[in-house]
């Protein structure tokens, strides 16, 4: 080609720079060139051409459009060091080439072994102490700092100086005693030396005494006891003036006494005794153990058809045994165990706290709240009851047996099976390559049960055939490829159902999250052929109007289906696979709803939050006195915006000595919460109560206030 007047040879306008980078980290060597025509760029390391993704798509080096060389991660071993070296970029066009300056790529290094570890030092209080250290070899050369008891030392304190590798403490105090660690650091990271102990002689004294504690049963508790002395005092613990029983207690290196899970028998007085040859000191503290209510069995969300009976379990424990009661969200009515059943009421609570609702109606749908109450606290759990109407929740048709891929001979006969079921009974139609079939072709007919027959096959009959089963509840399709050749079989192999594995059992739901459902099932009944694998199909009215295959080649009878939508009802069925084909489907699972997603907390538009909160209307119901010192507050919300973190229940005394005292708050920190229990109230006192929605620091409008007077004695049931 001729030299064009405006063309010019390459020149490098941005040269690569030396770089030091940690192993495994990304980095870029820059290179930019000008020239006409635009030059091509290649890189060389130590004189050899560098392979990039242009040569091998799996390469960890990428040649960027700008000409820069990008390393996804620096590869560097003890011996193999393919990325370290001296790089140049070369820009070429037909007029010549330009070579950049050399740029070295060095891999930062920090070895593990210290050239000199600090050693233990013993000094008397008031004397100077010197700790020496030489960090590990590294590139760049590491610097050092010191830690005492895992906390970095501030060398601005006038008694402390750090020069080279030496830590010098003048005029030591007993508080200087501890474990000193030298830390070598560079861009790779940090390495800690072996710790060295600095001992400063002293008589036993307490730096930290144990303090009295009140805990809930099963909580961990720690009694601290920090001492110092010269020589180091021995520290031991006693309980109620006796040695500690073995096994229940864990004494840490800093002499902290820890009980992992407290029991009521752990109550008592704990004494820390510090002793050395020059003295003995004792410090004690008491432990009080309370047992708040706890759920043994929580109620769970259930989906039930009209007319059925549902039971929500709610078993609790605590000390004392909690009082359990139920309430439907939005209702003032409380249900207690052993309450005589009201005429026409279909709800009852068993002595163990289970709520049973008979002859389920649509109006029963909603959230049911189980609450447990003791002096040690209160808890509540919510479960949603969804009521389904069998007629409106019909799944789409199910294709029991669909067509199989097959290769047949010219002039042969094809039989493409399609057997479907459903309520209402589906209509079967066929498509070829997505278009209605058979049209007017007399060679093709759809037989009574839906099988497509094509006689006198031609090469042009090759293609993808799709059986579509359609009803008012949706449609389901199944495709197969027909290949017509000179050498195929003359007629379709008619698989007997006995060649196929039996259908698996009804899948059971064993776990549910926002985006997944875990299913388990049993293989087909004994006597049927075994399965080599399974497929799982799913249907959700809110996702599509057809069954979707959500898992293939499943080798086990327990499987977690992922990628589901939150807060969505799904049905599942399972088919078994063997080399001959697919079984009939299993029975459908019970409907299951995935968990709801929590509202987003980060990255929100504050104006939008404030606007939405301002539109929330909270309606406070009449508070209910549960005991002389506890009141239940319930409310409803006209519209639940995206941005709500919870509700602030505000209450104050309006009678008695502290009338119109300041507001006290109780936060219901769950956006879906619609009730709260106020505890530790005064007997026979009137309270004003209101509820306010909130999100982070933003707050919505208060509900109207309600007043309630606590009783002098327990209210009768």
């Amino acid at each position: 080609s001729r030299l064009r007047q405006e063309d010019f040879p390459p020149r490098i306008v941005e040269h690569p720079s030396d770089v030091i980078v940690s192993k495994g980290e990304p980095t870029t060597l820059n290179c930019k060139a000008e020239g006409r025509p635009t030059p091509t760029i290649e890189w060389y390391k130590d004189g050899e051409r560098v392979e990039t993704d242009k040569d091998d798509p799996r390469s960890h080096r990428m040649l960027l459009p700008s000409g820069s060389l990008f390393f996804l991660r620096i590869v560097h071993g003890r011996r193999s060091k393919p990325d370290e070296g001296s790089y140049v970029c070369v820009a070429r066009n037909y007029l010549g080439e330009a070579v950049s300056r050399n740029a070295s790529l060095e891999v930062a290094l920090l070895r593990d072994d210290f050239r000199q570890n600090p050693t233990d030092v013993v000094v008397a209080a008031g004397e100077p102490a010197i700790l020496e250290c030489q960090p590990p070899r590294g590139h760049p050369e590491p610097t050092i700092y010191w830690k005492k008891d895992k906390v970095r030392i501030d060398d601005k304190e006038e008694r402390i100086s750090i020069r080279g590798g030496k830590l010098m403490i003048s005029n030591t105090r007993k508080s200087d005693a501890g474990m000193y660690t030298c830390v070598g650091t560079n861009m790779v990271g940090e390495r800690d030396s072996d710790p060295a102990e600095l001992t400063v002689f002293e008589r036993p004294t307490f730096l930290r005494r144990p303090i009295n504690q009140v805990v809930l049963e099963e909580e961990a508790v720690e009694f601290r006891c920090q001492v110092q002395g010269d020589p180091q005092p021995t520290v031991r613990w006693k309980k109620d003036d006796a040695d500690l029983p073995r096994g229940r207690y864990d004494i840490k290196d800093d002499y902290t006494l820890r009980i992992k899970k407290t029991m009521s028998t752990d109550e008592g007085t704990y004494m820390c005794i510090a002793e050395n040859r020059v003295g003995k000191m004792e410090a004690s503290a008491t432990l009080t153990v309370r047992a708040p209510p706890q759920f043994v069995v929580r109620p769970r969300d259930q989906i039930v058809a009209q007319g059925r009976t549902v039971t929500f379990p709610c078993e609790t424990k605590g000390n004392p045994q909690p009082a359990v009661f139920w309430q439907k969200e939005g209702s003032q009515n409380l249900l207690f165990p052993n309450q005589p059943q009201q005429p026409n009421s279909r709800c009852s609570v068993s002595p163990t706290g289970d709520l049973t609702i008979t002859n389920i109606q649509r109006s029963d749908a909603g959230y049911y709240i189980c609450q447990a109450l003791t002096v040690a606290g209160s808890i509540l759990a919510k479960a949603q009851l969804e009521v389904t109407d069998v007629l409106t929740d019909r799944p789409p048709p199910i294709i029991l047996q669909g067509p199989a891929n097959q290769t047949l001979a010219v002039d042969g006969t094809a039989l493409l099976k399609c057997k479907a079921t459903g309520d209402p009974l589906p209509v079967i139609s066929w498509l070829k390559e997505g278009f209605t079939f058979p049209g007017r072709d007399p060679r093709a007919t759809i037989q009574e049960q839906g099988t497509l027959q094509i006689k006198n096959l031609r090469i042009s009959d090759t293609g993808t055939y799709t059986c579509v089963a359609t009803s008012s509840s949706g449609e389901t399709s199944w495709s197969a490829v027909l290949d017509v050749t000179e050498s195929g079989a003359t007629i379709s192999k008619n698989y007997d159902l006995s060649d196929l594995p039996g259908p698996p059992s009804k899948p059971q739901v064993t776990d549910v999250t926002k985006n997944s459902v875990t299913l388990s099932w049993q293989p087909g009944t004994p006597g049927t052929l075994p399965a080599s694998a399974y497929i799982i199909e799913a249907f959700s009215q809110s996702v599509s109007n057809s069954w979707q295959t959500v898992a293939n080649h499943v080798k086990t009878t327990l499987y977690t289906v992922r990628g589901l939508r939150p807060n969505t009802i799904y049905l599942f069925m399972v088919r078994a696979i063997n080399p001959q084909g697919l079984s009939d489907p299993s029975p459908m699972s019970d409907p299951v709803r995935t968990q709801d997603i929590s509202p987003p907390a980060q990255g929100v538009d504050h104006r939008q939050v404030q606007k939405e909160l301002g539109d929330v209307l909270v309606r406070l119901h009449n508070p209910v006195v549960l005991t002389p010192t506890t009141v239940q507050v319930t409310w409803t919300v006209d519209r639940q915006p995206q941005f709500i973190q919870g509700y602030r229940v505000m209450y104050r005394q309006t009678s008695g000595l502290q009338a119109t005292s300041s507001w006290q708050n109780l936060d219901a920190k769950v956006p879906t919460e619609r009730s709260a229990v106020l505890v530790n109230l005064k007997k026979g006192v009137t309270y004003e109560i209101k509820v306010r929605p909130y999100f982070n620091e933003f707050q919505g409008m208060d509900s109207e206030s309600k007043t309630v007077r606590t009783t002098e004695e327990a209210p009768s049931a």
Epitope: K45, E48, D56, V75, G77, R79, S80, P82
Partner: antibody, heavy 118, light 105 residues
Amino acid sequence: QVQLVQSGAEVKKPGASVKVSCKASGYTFTGYYMHWVRQAPGQGLEWMGWINPKNGDTEFPQKFQGRVTMTRDTSITTAYMELSRLRSDDTAVYYCARESGDDAFDIWGQGTMVTVSS
Amino acid sequence: DIQMTQSPSSLSASVGDRVTITCRASQSISSYLNWYQQKPGKAPKLLIYAASSLQSGVPSRFSGSGSGTDFTLTISSLQPEDFATYYCQQSVGLFFGGGTKVEIK
């Protein structure tokens, strides 16, 4: 793609030498150490040493020093392992293997069977 | 030289079993340990490097753990294709363990 291809099987007499080649392709030959490992029939893996293709440096365990030579030809991206003064207990499959930047042998040759028999 | 001791030398197991193989170094090798699988007539294949990192393309049922002198290779649910011999290798001095043959029970 990245691969190592070794020379074919050899039959040698005791006292002779054998030279096995290992042709590397699909990566920068000089960027990765090459190791040799052998496996006698029914036995485990035995490391024989390495060569740095960049500069020809080598290292061998005590057992093989003086009997094994490792070389390379960067122009044809090939490594060689020569074992001299062969004995019957040198009968084994000899493998070359590339050492990755993660200090492991990530790519192996297909192996070369060397039989030493009188 | 740092010696590598692998145990057991062989074991019988069934498909679906959890299998554990151990490897002990005669002195600390930090996390410089690799695991390989070898099938008869084939070259070894890298499974785990740096004691616990899974090599690209290796099924997640294989896992490695340990540091210092004691290391473990675990196959969480043995598959038919997993019956083979497994070797540990320390990447400081590059010596291999004696191997563990996993056979069908």
